[in-house]
Interface confidence: low
């Protein structure tokens, strides 16, 4: 006999004998038990052996049983969620073996000092691994590699130094991140790699700003909007990110992110990304949006441009996501705005002088009469980036501009895949002649189309850069027009502001803006890097248009892209997919590679 | 058809005992859960205890300790042995088979009647 | 426990009518998971042992006329007869099935006007 309760949920027994004083598991539980809540016991020990013939159970709750050793010598097949926190647990066995379906491991507030190289083998299903409030100092190299389908990974509160510089390698579907509160000094150059986090914490760390440090800072910068400060109690997705909680413990707790790095050599590869304090004058390889759409906060994250190889001047690549999958929560598009320092929260604040982009090019494909590669003939509503100028706070169906914070959301059902490729050549100078208008017609066959033209010209090399103005029509839920001013920021030597002027009106929500038409051109912008150097016209390969157009010297140039009813689709740009990029010709590592 | 015939009831002093059964027909006995329910003269429905086709008991706390229940599935046969039998254990006990797991009772018995008086 | 409340403690109504009783549970008796209220009524006559009516709220066991529903979720529950009729005078019994121990309500007593 037992004190324990039942309770149904679907189709598995729940059995609870929380707080009964209990020293061992009872000897009289339901056979098909399937979530057995043993916590606030003094069990003292614990073996997976006296469950092995619970053959239903998928929950084991043993917090805060006192338990100061497991013993992982019965096979759990079944068992999804273990939670073992608030023990007194000094080390953990192999796991893998015994729990080899487990998806969620809770280890916080124990005794941890140290994790075995091997601890995770075996745990390939493992989502959420919860390592809070331990005496970590460090972590074996390796130790996530086992687990390539982590979501959630919780370091917080232990007393890390240092990271292994792999530790994230392969962990594409991670989305949080926990590291506050530990004792880091840096994190190791390419360490995040090419992943999307949507939400990361590192603040009360013990950063130390030198030039080590510059590729965090970089990181920092393109991931501004996904860096948050943990509160007790706070869901993270009701806060707003806060990249400045992450602070140089030996420079007066200054942000990290605008830590100058005056002095740092730029060429000795301290960093994955370029300096901007000093790039080369070459063409950018790639600019590259990526969003998420697992959660309610769609935050645009910019990679920074890399300068391409001064041989390569021929012949680059922007390079755009493999066919979207509707169950992957990320996306890649490719975005017009450069991700300069004003798309920083509005508590940051800029400073041109530390990061100024030198180069940026920007591509925006035109309809064309390719299908996708899902051979979806109708323009149902696809993958389409909408950028809407308004900080994380603002409803998601606000018109209220907000111009310093870029928000990038996208339909969380879409089946259309997104462009795959495009290659970009670059001619000599002066050898291409440059159109300077483009006609943009909206296609709506129940009214008048609405014309959208931009006017650009083309100056001469020299330090001014030319003002421009573009009228476009965005299908909002409103009528109310909303004017949009961005001020745009120029190259540093230039010694005249570039003002862009985008006037925005709103029609009744009937009037649904489905398409460009399909002689609209692709739009690439290029950036000098300096005011002497002639202009770089970068051509984009007419693989589906007939015209282009050249938008020279604009430090940024920003398309203003509706939520509900977008009118700018992404067609496919060239016929290569996911699958087939291996032997793609496209893809040489000469040139830019696929993202995840 | 489902039957349920309980039998062992009887008038008992405080701290006595008694044996309860339950003789069950009609069914696949060992394929479901088995449950005591009482009703006190006058009041109202109490679970008194359960046992799962897998032979594991359950009991509310008024009766932990002193009653025990177990079945025999060779027999078809639930019981229900209750001691430190006190004056509010007076009422009419019903054996019942449970749906699924201890939950909603779908047939009843007709009842034994247990008094514990002086 | 979770503590069953019935209203009212007796109820009388012409025979045709409609008669409705209310059951309430101290806590939520949905499970988020499969979306199901565990709650089951029964009728109990007059030296009878008690009858399953309905349960999962509105599940009818089979055999039980249909005048008789269920309704209602989370901790708010409702048996109607549609229609009353003479032999549906009893005592009606609410229960959760939802967490052990179980527990019952105390019982309306529908009587004929």
């Known amino acids: 006999q037992h004190t324990c309760s039942i309770s149904k949920v679907t189709s598995l027994l729940e059995v609870n004998c929380e707080n009964k004083k209990l020293t061992a598991l009872p000897a009289d539980l339901p056979a098909d038990t399937g979530i057995l809540h043993l916590g606030e016991n003094q069990l003292g020990t614990f073996s997976t052996a006296s469950l092995v013939h619970f053959t239903h159970l998928t929950y084991l709750y043993l917090d805060r049983c006192e338990l100061t050793s497991l013993q992982t010598n019965g096979k759990l097949i079944k068992l999804e969620n273990l939670d073992l926190s608030h023990n007194n647990l000094k080390s953990l066995p192999s796991l893998g073996w015994a729990l080899p379906a487990l998806t969620t491991l809770d280890v916080s507030f124990n005794k941890l000092g140290s994790l075995s190289p091997g601890v995770l083998d075996g745990l390939s299903q493992l989502q959420e691994l919860y390592l809070q409030n331990n005496d970590l100092k460090s972590l074996p190299p390796g130790l996530l590699l086992p687990t390539t389908k982590l979501k959630k990974l919780n370091l917080a509160n232990n007393k890390l130094r240092e990271l292994p510089s792999g530790l994230l390698d392969g962990l594409e579907d991670l989305d949080t991140l926990y590291l506050q509160r530990n004792w880091l000094r840096t994190i190791p150059k390419g360490f995040f790699g090419t992943l999307l986090l949507p939400f990361v914490f590192l603040h009360a760390n013990s950063w130390y700003c030198d030039c080590e440090i510059l590729y965090f800072r970089h990181w920092l910068q393109e991931n501004a909007n996904n860096v948050y400060l943990w509160k007790q109690g706070v869901d993270v997705k009701d806060t707003t990110p806060n990249v400045a909680s992450v602070r140089c413990a030996n420079l007066d707790n200054a942000p990290v992110y605008s830590y100058p790095g005056k002095g740092c050599p730029t060429s000795s590869g301290d960093t994955d990304y370029d300096d901007y304090d000093d790039i080369p004058d070459v063409p950018a390889t790639r600019t590259e949006v990526k969003f998420s759409t697992n959660t309610k906060v769609h935050t645009t994250h910019w990679s920074l441009l890399a300068a391409a190889p001064s041989t390569s001047q021929d012949s680059q690549m922007i390079s755009l996501p493999p066919t979207h999958k509707p169950t992957k929560k990320q996306s890649t598009f490719i975005h017009t705005q450069s991700p300069g320092f004003t798309t920083l929260p509005e508590t940051m604040e800029s400073n041109p002088t530390f990061y100024s982009l030198k180069l940026n090019t920007v591509l925006i494909p035109s309809p064309t009469t390719l299908e996708p590669t899902s051979t979806q003939a109708t323009p149902e509503p696809n993958i389409q980036p909408m950028l809407t100028t308004s900080t994380l706070t603002t409803p998601e169906h606000s018109t209220t501009p907000v111009p310093t914070t870029t928000i990038l959301t996208t339909p969380e059902h879409s089946t259309i895949p997104v462009p795959t490729t495009a290659i970009l050549t670059t001619p000599k100078p002066s050898t291409i002649p440059v159109p300077t208008t483009a006609t943009l017609t909206t296609l709506e066959p129940s009214t008048t189309p609405v014309p959208t033209t931009a006017t650009l010209t083309t100056p001469e090399p020299s330090t001014t850069l030319v003002p421009t103005t573009a009228t476009l029509t965005t299908p909002e839920h409103s009528t109310t027009p909303v004017p949009t001013t961005a001020t745009l920021t120029t190259p540093e030597h230039s010694t005249t502001p570039v003002p862009t002027t985008a006037t925005l009106t709103t029609p009744e929500p009937s009037t649904t803006l489905t398409n460009l038409v399909s002689t609209i051109s692709p739009v690439l912008t290029t950036t000098l890097t300096t005011p002497e150097s002639t202009p770089i016209e970068t051509i984009l390969e007419q693989f589906f248009t007939t015209e282009l157009t050249l938008l020279p010297t604009l430090e940024s140039t920003t398309t203003i892209i509706p939520e509900q009813n977008s009118f700018l689709n992404l067609p496919e740009v060239a016929l290569v997919s996911s699958d087939t990029s291996e032997s793609s010709p496209f893809l040489n590592s000469d040139f830019c590679c696929f993202l995840p | 058809e489902v039957q349920l015939v309980e039998s062992g009831g009887g008038l008992v002093k405080p701290g006595g005992s008694l044996r309860l059964s339950c003789a069950a027909s009609g069914f696949t006995f060992s394929s479901f859960a088995m449950s005591w329910v009482r009703q006190a003269p006058g009041k109202g429905l109490e679970w008194v205890s359960s046992?799962?086709?897998?032979?594991?008991?359950y009991y509310p706390d008024s009766v932990l300790g002193r009653f025990t229940i177990s079945r025999d599935n060779a027999k078809n046969s639930l019981y229900l042995q209750m001691n430190s039998l006190r004056a509010e254990d007076t009422a009419v006990y019903y054996c019942?088979?449970?749906?699924?797991?201890?939950?909603?009772?779908?047939?009843w018995g007709q009842g034994t009647t247990v008094t514990v008086s002086r | 426990d979770i503590v069953m409340t019935q209203s009212p403690d007796s109820l009388a109504v012409s025979l045709g009518e409609r008669a409705t009783i209310n059951c309430k549970s101290s806590?939520?008796?949905?499970?988020?998971?499969?979306?199901?209220?565990?709650l089951a009524w029964y009728q109990q006559k007059p030296g009878q042992p008690p009858k399953l009516l309905i349960y999962?709220?509105?599940t009818r066991e089979s055999g039980v006329p249909d005048r008789f529903s269920g309704s209602g979720s989370g901790t708010d529950f409702t048996l109607t007869i549609s229609s009353l009729q003479a032999e549906d005078v009893a005592v009606y019994y609410c229960?959760?099935?939802?967490?052990?121990?179980?527990?019952f309500g105390g019982g309306t007593k529908l009587e004929i006007k």
């Open positions: 999962f709220t509105s």
């Open positions: 806590q939520s008796l949905l499970n988020s998971r499969n979306q199901k209220n565990y």
């Open positions: 019942a088979r449970s749906r699924g797991y201890e939950d909603y009772f779908d047939y």
């Open positions: 229960q959760q099935h939802y967490s052990s121990p179980w527990t």
């Open positions: 046992i799962t086709s897998a032979g594991t008991p």
